[in-house]
């Protein structure tokens, strides 16, 4: 049965991949960004079910082509912090919420999403869990 | 469970051409990098270069690139290392491992050895 | 390209004593990037740690992982038999991915 140190530092690691994502949203978002249009053209592949943490193997396998989307990005006006500490900060959280050695065969939805998409459904999971948690 | 299988051991002469092999199961193999690793006998671990085999992208050491080619064919899973004139020096054991975007290596094969003598 | 430079180069000790070995950096990255792995005679490299301090699934919590900038550290904190092995660092905070030279870990 997990801790009750193990919920709250669960807890902890979903809010900073929650933080994150929005953060990579928000910048998307921006009504200045003038790569926006180009970005929505790339596909994301969306999970069929996402309910549990083991669930985020299909958010690691994305992680790719959402570096290459943000890479893209990059521009005066649409600035993150350095792309690859993001996404690599993203990973390290994700395998140590779901477990480095997650045996899952992600489950995809049959119809693609655009980034926004994509980053709005990993927001909702991430709050889902946390409110469960609290 | 994830498993990456490498091509049996390799003798082979200075000069002759040798492409080993790296297959992965148990995983969507087009989602990860691939990468690849030399060990020198009773030496350390040198990365040599990944490719992702979801679109190709491949990228190499300073100190192997134009050394080898490193290749992908994901529609049987595989990677690939290659060499078009083997040279005595590049007898070593090589790994490939699934490497992970933040550089984590997480699942490694269990190496071929690539021996290169006269 | 980052250098990494493990010290010390053989670590003699009896199981149940505490190991502390240390990658040095020759410039600051991440920690997300600080990798740890193990490697036994005939054997593939094992991952062990990964950004710095999290133990990869199955990984007995006797191995942990501290640091961050330029200084690195690995701590097993009771010997056990099977973890005398050669122990290499590695970083991925800017390309190429470099590995540091190895620890080697043996009984004395």
């Known amino acids: 049965a997990p801790t009750s140190s193990s919920t709250k530092k669960t807890q902890l690691q979903l809010e900073h991949l929650l933080l994150d994502l929005q953060m990579i949203l928000n910048g998307i978002n921006n009504y200045k960004n003038p790569k926006l249009t180009r970005m929505l053209t790339f596909k994301f592949y969306m999970p069929k079910k996402a309910t549990e943490l083991r669930h985020l193997q299909c958010l690691e396998e994305e992680l790719k082509p959402l570096e290459e989307v943000l890479n893209l990005a990059q521009s005066k006006s649409f600035h993150l912090r350095d792309t690859k500490d993001l996404i690599s900060n993203i990973n390290v959280i994700v395998l140590e919420l779901k477990g480095s050695e997650t045996t899952l065969m992600c489950e995809y939805a049959d119809e693609t999403a655009t980034i926004v998409e994509f980053l709005n459904r990993w927001i909702t999971f991430c709050q889902s869990i946390i409110s469960t948690l609290t | 469970e994830v498993q990456l299988v490498q091509s049996g051991a390799e003798v082979k002469k200075p000069g002759e051409s040798l492409k080993i092999s790296c297959k992965g199961s148990g995983y969507r193999f087009t989602s990860y990098w691939i990468g690849w690793v030399r060990q020198m006998p009773g030496k350390g671990l040198e990365w040599m270069g990944i490719i992702y085999p979801g679109d190709s992208d491949t990228r190499y050491s300073p100190s192997f690139q134009g050394q080898v080619t490193i290749s992908a064919d994901k529609s049987i899973s595989a990677a690939y290392l290659q060499w078009s004139s083997l040279k005595a020096s590049d007898t070593a054991m090589y790994y490939c491992?699934?490497?992970?975007?933040?550089?984590?290596?997480?699942?490694w094969g269990q190496g071929t050895l690539v021996t290169v003598s006269s | 390209e980052i250098v990494l430079t493990q010290s010390p180069g053989t670590l003699s000790l009896s199981p149940g004593e505490r190991a502390t070995l240390s990658c040095r950096a020759s410039?600051?990255?991440?920690?997300?990037?600080l990798v740890w792995y193990q490697q036994k005679p005939g054997q593939a490299p094992r991952l062990l740690i990964y950004g710095a301090s999290s133990r990869a699934t199955g990984i007995p919590d006797r191995f942990g992982g501290s640091g961050s900038g330029t200084d690195f550290t690995l701590t097993i904190s009771r010997l056990e038999p099977e973890d005398f092995a050669v122990y290499y660092c590695q970083q991925y905070g800017s390309s190429p991915l470099t590995f540091g030279g190895g620890t080697k870990v043996e009984i004395k």
């Open positions: 491992a699934r490497q992970q975007v933040a550089g984590m290596l997480d699942y």
């Open positions: 410039q600051s990255f991440s920690s997300s990037y």
